[in-house]
């Protein structure tokens, strides 16, 4: 006699009997005999199980706290759970997305690289010379340096990675 | 490859008795669930009965409880029906079958032999 | 006993044609249900289990759905070898019982 000790894709072994797994959104009841398959009960509402499976319980859809910060970005299923994400300004804190912080800013002198979303924060960068920004933001990126040039005017005070350059009237040759 | 080859069958009175066997090749036959299933002329598929992979426990379809007895010898890879007090509603062909999966009376049958008959008249 | 109940009980089709078969079953049983195809004087032949899962070497053109009462297996296009009589199987619980048979034959 060879009892089982290895069962099929979607079977679980107990008591030497290869059993029948709950499929995705069903939890199980009670483990298969020689008489009966395996029992399962779809999960409730607000409950989800997500994979094949011989829980005896579903776990609950997350909860998405507004006084977290956090919104309903996909309503979960019986057999997916909640996904949040944060309101508009706030990302998450970790990819699980517990709770939100507020969008950070780029200081002046640097400017928004990647505009943040509900999951990433803001990425900001240094102004390149020639570049620059004189605000604390969240959207604005480094603007380049005015061309006194194309104004027909000179440049009187250079430009700084916060500060455009200040352009004027060219000198005049006296006659 | 994996054979079932049934014998056993013919001519029985009602009232008679006959064993049918099923010779089995090609798997490892100490590991499955085995049935027998039967097939009157022109009708549809009747479980009949099945057993454990090692012989330690059966279930048996009411319509043959307590008539008919399955039972195997895993050492020549054999399974058996031994068929009692048969009646003419008997009359069928009796295939065994290999359970698809490990445990249960229950499971889909995924391998057949090509069967045997029995017929039950006077 | 669990009854099966198969429809139609016989149908005709022609080749390249998409043909559907039902089976319900007296009660709930989840998704334990199993197809096979029978050809005359031949043995039945597994062909879908657990209501979907198609058994090792049976064509893609054969596929089952369904879950609780209601199962269906569907032959999206018909070839010459699939006209044969068809049944269904719930392996819920002993004993196993069979539907009375669906004969798909040649229009």
């Known amino acids: 006699p060879e009892p089982p000790t290895a069962c099929r894709e979607k079977q679980y072994l107990i008591n030497s009997q290869c059993c029948s797994l709950c499929q995705p959104g069903q939890k199980l009841v009670s483990d298969c005999t020689e008489f009966t398959e395996t029992e399962c009960l779809p999960c409730g509402e607000s409950e989800f199980l997500d994979t094949w499976n011989r829980e005896t319980h579903c776990h609950q859809h997350k909860y998405c706290d507004p006084n977290l910060g956090l919104r309903v970005q996909q309503k979960g299923t019986s057999e997916t759970d909640t996904i949040c994400t944060c309101e508009e300004g706030w990302h998450c804190t970790s990819e699980a997305c517990e709770s939100c912080v507020l969008h950070r800013s780029c200081s002046p002198g640097f400017g928004v690289k990647q505009i943040a979303t509900g999951v990433s924060d803001t990425i900001c960068e240094p102004c390149p010379v020639g570049f620059f920004s004189n605000v604390s933001s969240a959207f604005e990126k480094c603007h380049p340096w005015t061309s006194c040039e194309t104004k027909d005017l000179v440049v009187q005070q250079a430009g700084t990675n916060k500060t455009d350059v200040v352009c004027g009237p060219q000198d005049r040759l006296r006659a | 490859e994996v054979q079932l080859v049934e014998s056993g069958g013919g001519l029985v009175q009602p009232g008679g008795s006959l064993r049918l066997s099923c010779a089995a090749s090609?798997?490892?036959?100490?590991?499955?669930?085995m049935s027998w299933v039967r097939q009157a002329p022109g009708k549809g598929l009747e479980w009949v009965s099945a057993i454990k992979y090692d012989g330690g426990s059966t279930g048996y379809a009411d319509s043959v409880k307590g008539r008919f007895t399955i039972s195997r010898d895993n050492s020549k890879n054999t399974l058996y029906l031994q068929m009692n007090s048969l009646r003419a509603e008997d009359t069928a062909v009796y295939y065994c079958?290999?359970?698809?999966?490990?445990?249960?009376?229950?499971?889909?049958?995924?391998?057949w032999g090509q069967g045997t008959l029995v017929t039950v008249s006077s | 006993d669990i009854q099966m109940t198969q429809s139609p009980s016989s149908l005709s089709a022609s080749v390249g044609d998409r043909v559907t078969i039902t089976c319900r079953a007296s009660q709930g049983i989840s998704s334990y249900l199993a197809w096979y195809q029978q050809k005359p004087g031949k043995a039945p032949k597994l062909l879908i289990y657990?209501?979907?899962s198609l058994q090792s070497g049976v064509p893609s053109r054969f596929s089952g759905s369904g879950s609780g009462t209601d199962f269906t297996l569907t032959i999206s296009s018909l070839q010459p070898e699939d006209f044969a009589t068809y049944y269904c199987q719930q392996h819920y619980t002993t004993p196993p019982t069979f539907g009375q048979g669906t004969k798909v034959e040649i229009k």
């Open positions: 090609g798997f490892n036959f100490g590991g499955y669930y």
């Open positions: 079958a290999r359970a698809l999966y490990y445990t249960g009376f229950y499971r889909p049958l995924d391998y």
């Open positions: 657990a209501a979907s």
